[in-house]
Interface confidence: low
């Protein structure tokens, strides 16, 4: 019989008699063989973490700057169930930490230095630690004590807390530092009316402040938001412009061995019992005892976190860059406005042979990150393991979901100005074998289909998002009778055409070789009724120009295209018969990189663009002998977006919205996990 | 294209409640921007009544304050106007709108209103 | 509240004249920080909701023909129509956005001869 309880940590008396209460009451409403409680008393949150990772007990909920040290070695642990505050219908498990500042006032987040400071305190998150941890490497040497830099980098501060005798400057704009609200300028209140006085020239508070403070519209938009590319942004746009997005109140678990379906399972029945105005006797949001015991007491619920996210995404990239500038206090030897070396995803064993390649011909300028799935790279690029990579359009929707920003656009045909120029996108089409004349698009159901892969424009988003609009249902492996869609559940019918081997079997990279464009086409040839493609894949792979044995021998004209209107047509025929237009692939970065990811890859097109003739002797960037490695090889270069730089403007309303319209059939564990994040 | 479309009952007797909903398409009303609840009379004088922020934050106009309140699903796009102890004074067409955040309070996109008498 | 008074409260005209109609507020409605003017114009045809106009006091929202034109500083608004066309039939309604609440004038009722 499977062990159903769950050892709760409490870090007080007054927590534990909570805890046993909370057991006690569980037990009366819960079913022998469900979840059941059990109580751990230890000293401090800290002896907690590490109890839980000594599997000493299983849960405790912890703030933010605790999740960090939660998930750091060796304690290795995992967000699982986050608290919520408001309604159910609108839970807000984040709060943003934003800087505040008037209208006129005319700096940007890079031009703090000189200024005056408004802090809620010494020590709280959105009014110091982040804050000041992302300014952390532009504070003046020695950085230790901290306060001293920070007193010397603004001009005079509102810092209650601090200790007045040793760093005066940090109380000069407020009435001594008293750490409570007889200090009119304490907490986030204060922090904002010491702004809004004139006292100060940036407030360091949370998004929702502004909006307590001021409930009139016309004075609020007085104030903006400083962003952390150098912009500015009404302060509506908070989740735009932050300085970090920070988790509210947090169970956490072992990473491996955790528990958290159970723990999830004893929460979700515990607020159906014992929520908000759910039960006189017992109440799991108050403490009679104290304040926030085991939960805090303004919390209305719990919501899953997503299994996919691990304290790192959860954190998210500022919050975690943050606190570690804070702990570790290590900056680079000195602030240069060089780049640093773009670290650009791999995806598998071919494309990191292809990227060492370039990384070597790029003297320094490119380092190369690995890894198995195109959302594991995304991930990277998120958390900063890595910063750059090219995407599908279905991939930039999800890198989009996701906080990442397109920056140089594919362009496939050849033009004047290439780079100045992106073009309007490809055509994705559903391809047929001449000799099956009996197929159309009507009749596609019990058919064997090929796809470049789940998630991905031409051979997934555009052609089930049309066929979802027919069927209503997401059981596309029940409408194909088999196929290949590389990223499917191992043991789906869309997996039983591939043809990678062992592990390798219908994943979504080039370890399968039914996988992306070429692979789709190759599954059609060998195997299938249907590809769906792109409207370059056909004349790519046929008349000799792919030397590879299946393809050697294989001729344009014994392929036709399904057309939405039940026809057919030749290949050629691709601009009066496809399914849809695809965006291009695009570069995807973090924001604060995108400015070096931009210059950097236009100085190394230049050098190994399509402008290098010979690629025998020479390496190409946009050369792998119909791969598609790193970028595809019908790439003629990488173009200026211009003002198409957000995932919607570059995708477009039409393609946003098809995409959004299949997120229904998502199987996709990280847009899950970043639409958590930001709903 | 942004739409909205107010619905309700077209009567209510004085002293009862007057629940209107405003159901939006074509943009998400948690996504920006501020959700408004504006009254016409017989007489066509227009009268400002409240809104609720894409943040879920509301401001309510001071005359009505005490009786009235906007609440929304975001679940269904939808947000809700409540009016309690109607009197026959609330007699009007009902319209929601959405400003933009520059300029605020500047109304561009509007129902077309559904109208709703109080009488016994 | 801030109030505001639109005259004429009516007027007929003939189709191809122009028409002005102005909006007095109780108070300035123009912001010394950004030389901004909180006041918008709405036109509501007859069984219609209001559409939109002008704010800013002068800057037409996109769709509008260029016909309809917003002037005015601080307390005194005017909105003209260069060439009235028979589908101008409409109230047109003034409304401020500087200070909480927001108010709208009483309108000035367009008819055509």
């Known amino acids: 019989v499977p062990d159903k309880t769950v050892r709760w940590c409490a870090v007080s008396e007054h927590e534990a008699t909570k805890c046993q209460s909370f057991r006690d009451h569980m037990k009366s409403v819960i079913p022998s063989d469900g979840p059941s409680v059990a109580c751990v008393k230890k000293a401090s949150y800290l002896d907690c973490i590490r109890a839980i990772a000594a599997n000493e007990a299983d849960a405790v909920t912890l703030d933010a700057g605790l999740v960090y040290d939660a998930y750091l070695a060796p304690n290795n642990l995992k967000p699982v169930v986050a608290e919520f505050y408001g309604s159910k219908e609108d839970p807000q498990t984040f709060y943003y930490a934003v800087a505040v500042v008037k209208k006129d006032s005319g700096f940007q987040m890079n031009q703090l230095r000189g200024k005056k400071s408004c802090h809620t305190g010494l020590g709280r998150s959105a009014g110091w630690n982040i804050p000041i941890g992302l300014l952390y490497c532009d504070l003046p040497e020695p950085r230790k004590p901290l306060e001293k830099a920070v007193a010397n980098f603004f001009s005079g501060s509102c810092a209650p807390c601090a200790d007045g005798t040793d760093f005066p400057q940090l109380c000069q704009l407020c009435p001594g530092c008293g750490c409570s609200t007889l200090n009119q300028y304490f907490g986030y209140s204060g922090a904002f009316k010491c702004l809004k006085d004139g006292a100060g020239d940036v407030a360091f508070v949370k998004h929702s402040t502004i909006f307590e403070n001021l409930a009139n519209k016309a004075d609020r938009d007085q104030y903006e938001l400083l962003c952390l590319d150098n912009t500015r942004k009404p302060v509506d746009e908070y989740k735009d412009c932050h300085l970090a997005q920070v988790p509210s109140h947090t169970v956490v678990a072992r990473s491996m061995g955790g528990k958290e379906d159970l723990i999830w399972e004893l929460l979700n029945q515990a607020q159906e019992h014992f929520g908000k105005d759910k039960s006189k006797e017992f109440q799991l949001f108050s403490s009679p005892h104290g304040k926030d015991l085991l939960f805090k007491d303004s919390a209305h619920g719990f919501l899953k976190v997503p299994p996919r996210m691990d304290a790192k995404m959860y954190l998210g990239y500022e919050y975690v860059t943050a606190i570690r500038n804070l702990r570790e206090g290590t900056c680079p030897e000195a602030p240069t406005d060089e780049c640093k070396p773009v670290k650009w995803c791999a995806l598998s064993h071919h494309e990191r042979l292809k990227c060492d390649e370039w990384s070597v011909n790029s003297v320094g300028k490119i380092e190369c990150v690995s890894a198995e799935t195109t959302e594991d790279c995304i991930a990277k690029i998120m958390n900063g393991e890595a910063d750059a990579m090219s995407l599908d359009g279905g991939f930039v929707y999800i890198a989009g979901k996701c906080g990442l920003v397109p920056v140089l656009a594919e362009n496939y045909n050849k033009s004047d100005n290439c780079e100045d120029t992106p073009e309007a996108g490809y055509f994705a089409i559903a391809v047929v074998k001449k000799s099956a004349s009996d197929l159309t698009w009507d009749n596609l159901k019990g058919k064997k289909s090929c796809h470049t892969a789940v998630g991905r424009t031409a051979g997934w988003n555009i052609p089930m998002g049309l066929l979802y609009n027919k069927i209503n249902h997401c059981r596309f492996d029940e409408f194909f009778s088999e196929g290949c869609a590389p990223g499917s559940k191992k043991d789906s019918s869309l997996c039983k055409l591939c043809m990678g081997s062992g592990l390798n079997l219908c994943e979504p990279n080039n370890k399968e070789g039914y996988y992306g464009y070429t692979g789709a086409f190759r599954c059609l040839v060998e195997k299938g009724d249907v590809a769906f493609v792109k409207h370059q894949t056909v004349p790519q792979n046929t008349g000799g120009k792919n030397p590879d044995p299946w393809a050697k021998n294989l001729n344009e004209k014994d392929y036709e295209l399904l057309c939405l209107d039940g026809t057919r047509k030749p290949v050629e025929e691709y601009a009066n018969c496809h399914l849809a237009r695809a965006p291009n692939h695009a570069v995807v970065t973090r924001k604060d990189k995108e400015a070096c990811v931009h210059k950097i890859l236009r100085q190394q097109q230049h050098l190994f663009g399509s402008n290098v003739t010979d690629c025998s002797g020479n390496f190409c960037l946009f050369r792998s002998e119909t791969k598609d490695l790193l970028f595809r090889d019908d790439t003629v270069c990488l173009a200026k977006l211009h003002d198409r730089n957000t995932y919607e403007k570059y995708l477009g309303e039409e393609y946003v919205k098809a995409v959004g319209n299949l997120r229904k059939c998502s199987t996709s564990s990280l847009l899950e996990a970043c639409t958590f994040r930001r709903p | 294209e942004v739409q909205l479309q107010e619905s309700g009952p077209d009567l209510v007797k004085p002293s009862q409640s007057l629940s209107l909903t405003c159901t939006v398409t074509?943009?998400?009303?948690?996504?920006?921007?501020?959700w408004h609840w504006i009254r016409q009379f017989p007489e066509n004088k227009l009268e400002w009544l409240g809104y609720?922020?894409?943040?879920?934050?509301?401001n309510y106009s001071p005359s009505l304050k005490s009786r009235f309140s906007i609440t929304r699903d975001t679940s269904k796009n939808q947000f809700f106007l409540q009016l309690n102890s109607v009197t026959t004074e609330d007699t009007a067409t009902y319209y929601c709108?959405?400003?933009?955040?520059?300029?605020?309070?500047?109304?561009?996109?509007w129902g077309q209103g559904t109208t709703v008498t109080v009488s016994s | 509240d801030i109030e505001l008074t639109q005259s004429p409260s009516s007027l007929a005209v003939s189709v191809g004249e122009k028409v002005t109609m102005t909006c007095k507020s109780s108070?300035?409605?123009?912001?010394?920080?950004?030389?901004?003017?909180?006041l918008a114009w709405y036109q509501q045809k007859p069984g219609q909701s209001p559409k939109l106009l002008i704010y800013?006091?002068?800057t037409r929202e996109s769709g509008v023909p260029d016909r309809f034109t917003g002037s005015g500083s601080g307390t005194d608004f005017t909105l003209t129509i260069s060439s009235v066309k028979a589908e101008d039939l409409s109230v047109y309604y003034c409304?401020?956005?500087?200070?909480?609440?927001?108010?709208f004038g009483s309108g000035t009722k367009l008819e055509i001869k």
């Open positions: 709108a959405r400003d933009g955040y520059s300029p605020p309070y500047a109304m561009d996109y």
């Open positions: 409304q401020q956005y500087y200070s909480y609440p927001p108010t």
């Open positions: 108070q300035s409605l123009l912001y010394s920080t950004n030389q901004k003017n909180y």
């Open positions: 800013w006091a002068s």
């Open positions: 609720i922020h894409s943040s879920g934050a509301t």
């Open positions: 074509g943009y998400s009303i948690t996504s920006g921007y501020s």
